[in-house]
């Protein structure tokens, strides 16, 4: 069998909401993956599991099942959304993310994704992880790959 290539493209969009009383930030982060099947037979994308970390703490997880199949020598682009919550011991971030005087409230998140594919009863897992900048202060739609190398304005400690 030839390889199945998984390429994490980046953040597609991030939608923000807040709970004022709980000083909590809710970020719905949609990511884009390219999965390429280099084989001469179809493969099934059985599931995608993803998690997002902020400051070494897992702030969101998602799992998609029975996603799609990819034909021979074909590629599919898949979007998946991870709902994340920045709260509790990280509630200090609420102050930073809600500063109306700052235009871009970039925070660094680590995106981890594992894709499980199957073909002829054989299962294969491919994992990727990438640091991305996400604006926690407003709803943002990114050009693909745009969120990777932005300058990040760090909150005061």
């Amino acid at each position: 069998p030839r390889s199945i290539d998984v390429k994490y493209i980046g953040v597609k969009s991030a939608y923000v909401s807040y709970d004022v009383q709980k000083r909590t930030i809710y970020l719905n982060i949609t990511n884009t993956l390219n999965i390429t099947n280099n084989n001469y037979y179809s493969v099934e994308v059985e599931n995608i599991t993803a998690q997002v970390q902020f400051a070494k703490t897992v702030i969101g997880k998602a799992r998609l099942n029975n996603i799609t199949h990819i034909g021979p020598l074909d590629m599919k682009q898949i979007d998946y959304t991870v709902p994340t919550v920045i709260a509790e011991e990280m509630s200090y971030m609420y102050d930073f993310c809600t500063l109306i005087s700052i235009k871009v409230h970039n925070i660094v998140l680590m995106m981890q994704v594992t894709v499980t594919t199957t073909y002829f009863g054989h299962s294969e897992q491919i994992s990727q992880e990438r640091y991305q900048y996400v604006d926690c202060g407003r709803n943002t739609t990114y050009q693909l790959g745009q969120s990777e190398y932005l300058n990040v304005l760090q909150p005061q400690q």
Epitope: V20, I100, S101
Partner: antibody
Framework: QVQLQQSGAELVKPGASVKISCKGS????????MNWVKQRPGKGLEWIGQ????????NYNGKFKGKATLTADKSSTTAYIHLSSLTSEDSAVYFC????????????WGQGTSVTVSS | DVVMTQTPLSLPVSLGDQASISCRSS???????????LHWYVQKPGQSPKLLIY???NRFSGVPDRFSGSGSGTDFTLKISRVEAEDLGVYFC?????????FGGGTKLESK
């Protein structure tokens, strides 16, 4: 330390226009909104609008749309206000003021530029 | 536009006295993020305004602790516990919760 240095006083004729400058130093000029505030003699303060030098984004007080145009030059770290079709009502002191990130208030002000409109 | 009403217009005080300035807004100044953007500035003759108190009650750096701010919603107060000569000037409240940003008409703190 943060400094905002404004250009000198102006005496202009009615119907003319004027451009006032505000040079910022001692901070990351491109990353802070710059505001402009009008104060007529013996009167209160009026917010004209603001500009984000990083990308030129602006927000105006509707009252000053068409009267004031805000611009900024990142390379010289200078913000400008252009006032057009001047009348006696535009005679005032104009202040630039930086919008601070963490206090979320106008925490540093220029010394003010006096504009007198007279024939 | 949000109207900011300051009282009194003029406040004659003796040095060492307490001074209290009121500021009332025509609508709530609580932002959707839960913060209240009500600031106080002081302006001395021939000078630019200076930030005194931000977000209702936070003293700006270098501001003496005889200055305090309080209030919520639409009603706010600036207090000076013991007025000193250097405190004399015009005090303005300001809101930036709503665009356009607006200022109170000012209160002149003067010596009796």
């Amino acid at each position: 330390q943060v400094q905002l240095q404004q250009s000198g006083a102006e005496l202009v004729k009615p119907g003319a226009s004027v451009k006032i400058s505000c040079k910022g130093s001692g901070y990351a000029f491109s990353s802070y909104w710059m505001n402009w505030v009008k104060q007529r003699p013996g009167k209160g303060l009026e917010w004209i609008g603001q500009i984000y030098p990083g990308d030129g984004d602006t927000n105006y007080n509707g009252k000053f749309k068409g009267k004031a145009t805000l611009t900024a030059d990142k390379s010289s770290t200078t913000a400008y206000i252009h006032l057009s079709s001047l009348t006696s009502e535009d005679s005032a002191v104009y202040f630039c003021a930086r919008w601070g990130h963490y206090d979320e208030a106008m925490d540093d002000w220029g010394q003010g530029t006096s504009v007198t409109v007279s024939s | 536009d949000v109207v900011m009403t300051q009282t009194p217009l003029s406040l004659p005080v003796s040095l060492g006295d307490q001074a209290s300035i009121s500021c009332r807004s025509s609508q709530s100044l609580v932002h959707s993020n839960g913060k209240t953007y009500l600031h106080w500035y002081v302006q001395k003759p021939g000078q630019s305004p200076k930030l005194l108190i931000y977000k209702i009650s936070n003293r700006f750096s270098g501001v003496p602790d005889r200055f305090s701010g309080s209030g919520s919603g639409t009603d706010f107060t600036l207090k000076i516990s013991r007025v000193e000569a250097e405190d004399l000037g015009v005090y303005f409240c300001s809101q930036i919760t709503h665009v356009p940003w607006t200022f109170g008409g000012g209160t002149k703190l003067e010596s009796k």
